[in-house]
């Protein structure tokens, strides 16, 4: 039809950085590059109907649908979204063409459904139909990596069954110990699913998707390193495949390697051999013992053997479920206002966990590390000296496991006061918790010495801020200290600190602090 | 000692196969690699394809792809390699040779298999 | 593929001569993780397999008599058979194992004048 305008539709996602709610507006912010949502004519619908490509939207995330019209002369236009009209201006691009936009910022899903843009020409009306959702976050998935051999080729293949399918990598470092941190220069990353250099030091490969990412490390026997000081294991559930890789460099190819379990030979089909040379002509051989699907008979102590070099072992336990072993009974600590210290757990887990440290209702990312024992140890030392109570909280597919820390430092008291007209009161957050006394200050005793016994009632750790204590002691009003100034005095072993009171005075009370060490 | 011992002389018919067999003996049949290599009469040397004992994983040359299989029977230490839909121009000695790594010298070679494709 | 070109085609080099067979490839064989090159030679007799003389560009195999040696880095290649015996008539190959496929050069024929 020679009248139709030719227009275009577009999508253009934007970096979050505004609150408010879905507006029409005709410059929308700065944004990633757009996306042709398409528009074409929709066929058997009365009257001129475009529509565009459904639009998914991750939730709080800022979108704007934007139209672009090549007609000529003047257009108006209406939105419409769930019955209700919005306001819509459109404005003319550098090439003279009509730019109708719908800014939708921070997603949620009342902003979820049809939009309808309603646009009359000098020539023709038409419609142009948007169907926005919220992404189905809860159907995504990211599951660790696990290897598989290619059919007919030395190469292992990375497989992650994740939603939505993962941009896999491998991982590749040829160092040893801290160089191969994941930022090191000495690690290759390779974004593929195949590999075929199956001879480095360390192998991983990672699976990452809106989820976050997921790494499996190839378990490696490597008969030219000192054996850890503890048999290393591996754990794996019923159904998963087992790789184990054993390495071994000699001077020459006079030697070879094979795989034992529980003393007896592997069958065949359940291993296989590569040789490469090396720096210096030496041999570098790997030798693959693999299972498909591990079932409870796999379990075991599998052993790597070589003619020029002392066997080393693994221990292999098949598990029916995931677990965390640590120990969950809370634990106190006490330390000074400037000691270094951190939280650590100590923890052997299948499959690996995912973590967190929180305090005050606020969370902390959480770091790992493997040790050589085959447990792993979570450190927290973000506290910044902090009283109260942290918690560490891990999971994984099969087991979830919450530990409890209180941390106290040992500072002097600190003493706020108020007062009423019956009586007053003095608060503490001091370490150890202090003990209190309160003196009148009279003629008698111009250095307030004279002590009040009476009407005193002391509350210790009354109060719990995210597991802070707080001390409190309360001095009731009678006759004998009426229009009298008191002192309270809060002490511990680092000290004490006092504030001063006047009974019973019109207006807001007048403390004066008091610090003695 | 270290050798590789081939299967005898063949005489086929144009668009048939050859197998010929390549037994090892005196070192670990699993832990060197075997390639095929032919020399046609008269011609120099040409690699045909490569296989890994352990695994069983081949790669082969593109001139032979979808013409060559090369397979291995670990219990007899044995290489195989089959050429199919036979041609005149395969006339050939057919070598097996071995090699430590996937790219490393042929340091034992086979004695050799004359296969003659002749209608 | 990486060709392999040898020259000449056949030489004719009087009995204790040092002869001199020359391989060039296409691309470079040397491999910059371990500074080896990655090229063989081969010598073949008249109803014999080809026998492996040289690896690693330069290093002897056990049992080939010092009279052989090879030379070169990257593209360029030497064999040389520094005294010519009698049982030194045979055909020569170059071959790269830097990638597969493996490829040799077309042979040398050396025969004695």
């Known amino acids: 039809n020679q009248d139709l305008p030719v227009i275009k539709c577009v999508l253009i996602n934007h970096k979050n950085n505004d609150s408010s709610v879905g507006k029409s507006s005709s410059y929308p912010m700065v944004s990633e590059s757009p996306e042709d949502l398409g528009c074409a004519l929709r066929p058997q619908s009365s009257g001129t109907v475009y529509e565009a490509a459904a639009v998914e939207v991750d939730v709080s995330a800022s979108i704007t649908l934007q139209v672009l019209v090549d007609a000529p002369g003047n257009i108006s236009c209406l939105w419409v979204f769930k019955h209700s009209s919005l306001n819509c201006q459109p404005h003319f691009d550098l090439q003279n063409r009509g730019v109708v936009s719908m800014v939708i910022l921070k997603m949620t899903e009342t902003q979820a459904g049809e939009y309808l843009l309603f646009i009359q020409s000098e020539a023709t009306n038409y419609t142009i139909l948007f169907t926005v959702s919220i992404r189905n976050t809860l159907l995504y998935t990211l599951r660790r990596p696990y290897f598989r051999k290619m059919e007919n080729q030395d190469a292992l293949v990375c497989i992650s069954e994740s939603v939505p399918e993962p941009i896999v990598e491998w991982v590749l470092c040829d160092s040893q110990g801290e160089s191969c941190k994941e930022e090191s220069p000495a690690v290759v990353k390779k974004e593929e699913k195949v590999l075929h250099e199956l001879f480095g030091t360390d192998i991983r490969c990672c699976a990452r998707n809106e989820l976050g990412r997921e790494c499996t490390r190839l378990f490696t026997i490597d008969l030219n390193q000192t054996p850890q000081t503890t048999l290393p294991q591996l754990f794996l559930k019923v159904g998963e495949p087992l790789w184990i890789r054993c390495k071994a460099v000699h001077v020459n190819h006079g030697f070879g390697l094979t795989w034992e379990l529980e003393n007896k030979a592997l069958e065949e089909g359940n291993y296989f051999e590569m040789s490469t040379y090396s720096t210096n002509r030496t041999m570098i051989r790997i030798l693959f013992a693999f299972v498909s699907s591990v079932a409870r008979n796999d379990t075991g102590y599998y052993t790597c053997s070589s003619s020029k070099h002392p066997s080393q072992s693994a221990l292999v336990t098949i598990v029916e479920k995931g677990f965390i072993n640590a120990t969950n009974s809370s634990e106190d600590y006490e330390i000074d206002q400037y000691e270094e210290f951190c939280f650590s757990v100590r923890f052997k887990a299948y499959p690996q966990i995912r973590c967190t440290w929180t305090f005050s209702r606020k969370s902390f990312p959480c770091e790992q590390k493997g040790l050589d024992n085959g447990y792993s140890i979570s450190k927290f030392c973000n506290h910044k000296h902090q009283p109260g109570e942290y918690i560490f909280h891990a999971e994984n597919d099969d087991a979830q496991f919450t530990k409890m820390f209180t941390l106290n430092i040992r500072r002097k008291p600190q003493v706020l006061a108020e007062a009423s007209a019956s009586q007053a009161s003095c608060f503490s957050d001091g370490y150890p918790l202090p003990s209190w006394t309160w003196k009148k200050c009279s003629d008698k005793s111009p250095n307030c010495t004279e002590e009040i016994t009476e009407g005193v009632w002391n509350r210790k750790a009354n109060r719990k801020v995210f597991g802070q204590w707080v001390s409190s002691s309360t001095l009731n009003m009678s006759e004998a200290i009426k229009g009298f100034l008191v002192k309270c005095c809060a002490y511990n072993s680092l000290g004490t600190s006092c504030e001063t009171i006047l009974l019973n005075s019109p207006g807001p009370f007048p403390f004066i602090q008091d610090n003695i060490s | 000692q270290v050798q590789l011992v081939q299967s005898g002389a063949e005489v086929k018919k144009p668009g048939a196969s050859v197998k010929v067999s390549c037994k090892a003996s005196g070192y670990t049949f699993t832990s060197y690699y075997m390639h095929w290599v032919r020399q046609a009469p008269g011609q120099g040397l040409e690699w045909m394809g490569i296989?890994?004992?352990?695994?069983?994983?081949?790669t082969y040359a593109q001139k032979f792809q979808g013409r060559v299989t090369m397979t291995r029977d670990t219990s007899t230490s044995t290489v195989y390699m089959e050429l199919s839909s036979l041609r005149s121009e395969d006339t050939a000695v057919y070598y097996c040779?071995?090699?430590?790594?996937?790219?490393?010298?042929?340091?034992?070679w086979g004695q050799g298999t004359m296969v003659t494709v002749s209608s | 593929d990486i060709v392999m070109t040898q020259s000449p085609d056949s030489l004719a080099v009087s009995l204790g001569e040092r002869a001199t067979i020359n391989c060039k490839s296409s691309q470079s064989v040397l491999y910059s993780s371990n500074n080896e090159n990655y090229l063989a030679w081969y010598q073949q007799k008249p109803g014999q397999p080809p026998k492996l003389l040289i690896y690693w560009a330069s290093t002897r195999e056990s049992g080939v008599p010092d009279r052989f040696s090879g030379s070169g880095s990257g593209t360029d290649f030497t064999l040389t058979i520094s005294s010519l015996q009698a049982e030194d008539v045979a055909v020569y190959y170059c071959q790269q194992y830097y990638s597969l496929p493996v490829t040799f050069g077309q042979g040398t024929k050396l025969e004695i004048k």
């Open positions: 296989i890994n004992p352990s695994s069983g994983s081949t």
């Open positions: 040779a071995r090699s430590v790594g996937a790219t490393s010298a042929f340091d034992i």
